[in-house]
């Protein structure tokens, strides 16, 4: 089982849309795949895929999940808010026929505020 996640870095404006993609590949067929998205280590959602369908379509606040055969799991955040900023990781595990798991690399999402003054304040708040 292998998981490739993208993009590595995503910078979007508040109120727009962010799309994170996870490609899940397995050399043999699988009956049930457990998938998980985390943000800064906290679980956003943990549905499974069987018979070509996701058990859940919602993933965290304003998050929509979709599965496009053969291998693409997409997390769409719309509209994006400032607190969507963070480090996202996609994880997958074949549960049937036998357990095998893998995870992607981090996608860092940066959300720029609509108000330029908020942006100045946010930058000023970083140390150094």
């Amino acid at each position: 089982l292998s998981v490739q996640q993208g993009p590595n870095l995503l910078q979007v404006r508040q109120g727009s849309q962010a799309t994170l993609v996870c490609q899940v590949d397995q050399a043999t067929a699988w009956e049930r795949l457990r998938v998980k998205w985390t943000k800064d280590g906290a679980i956003l959602c943990q549905p499974y895929i069987t018979n070509g369908s996701l058990s859940l379509g919602v993933c965290g606040p304003q998050g929509r999940l979709s599965w496009q055969a053969p291998s693409h799991l997409t997390l769409q955040l719309d509209p994006v808010s400032l607190n969507h900023s963070g480090a996202y990781v996609c994880w997958a595990a074949v549960e049937i026929p036998e357990l095998e798991e893998a995870e992607g690399n981090i996608t860092r999402l940066f959300v720029d505020p609509d108000d330029p003054t908020q942006n100045r304040n946010r930058i000023a708040s970083f140390p150094g």
């Epitope: 043999t28 055969a69 053969p70 893998a102």
Partner: antibody, heavy 120, light 113 residues
């Protein structure tokens, strides 16, 4: 590009252990998503998958051989090996190593094969 | 284990004519999760290792001549050579990767009539 080369004795006595090594060049056997297999082809041309070792060191074996087979690897030498115990004349075949990936699940690169005869 | 049954065992076709090789699996090789058939076709010439022609039942590997095509779904698959060339003389094998153990068909020997 990736190349695979089998090595080992061409003649093994019945009841002994067949040991072969596959040396991989141009690619790391630890690369995520790749599987390293042993396949044998009998004199009558039939192909049989023996088993694989994956990028993390996990193995899967053909149940028909599971009690006799071990596939291991040496990442420092970029090699993986086959051991088949208690061989008989029925194990006489050309043994090939091959690789496949999760993303494209076919044997895309093969060694040239080494003929192993089991005979006293 | 999934049993792969190829037919015919051997086939003689005239140059420029169509060659058809069949492969039947003992259970379906289609997955609704991925919309894929887990079936490959290989060509093996004398003294050489097998070479992949077709994967996922119908996807031709880059560099393989377009006279080679694969079709079928579920349990019944076909490899077609639309216009036989002299260099196509070889043994042809189907192979599934739906589950382990991976198994091959017994092969079809293709010759020129």
């Amino acid at each position: 590009q990736v190349q695979l080369q089998e090595s080992g004795p061409g003649l093994v006595k019945p009841a002994q252990t067949l040991s072969l090594t596959c040396t991989v060049s141009g690619f790391s056997i630890s690369t995520s998503g790749y599987y390293w297999s042993w396949i044998r082809q009998y004199p009558g041309k039939r192909l049989e998958w023996i088993g694989y070792i994956n990028y993390g060191g996990g193995t899967s074996y053909n149940p028909s051989l599971k009690s006799r087979v071990t596939i291991s690897r040496d990442t420092s030498k970029n090699q993986f090996s086959l051991k088949l115990t208690s061989v008989t004349a029925a194990d006489t075949a050309t043994y090939c190593c091959a690789t496949m990936a999760d993303r494209f699940a076919f044997f895309d690169v093969w060694g040239q094969g080494t003929m192993v005869t089991v005979s006293s | 284990d999934i049993v792969m049954t190829q037919s015919p065992d051997s086939l003689a076709v005239s140059l420029g004519e169509r060659a058809t090789i069949n492969c039947k699996s003992s259970q379906s090789l289609f997955s609704s999760n991925t919309n894929r058939n887990y079936l490959n076709w290989y060509q093996q010439k004398p003294g050489q290792s097998p070479k992949l022609l077709i994967y996922h039942a119908s996807t031709r590997l880059s560099g393989v001549p377009d006279r080679f095509s694969g079709s079928g779904s579920g349990t019944d698959f076909t490899l077609t050579i639309s216009s036989l060339q002299a260099e196509d003389v070889a043994d042809y094998y189907c192979q599934h990767h739906y589950e382990t153990p991976l198994t091959f068909g017994d092969g079809t020997k293709l010759e020129i009539k």
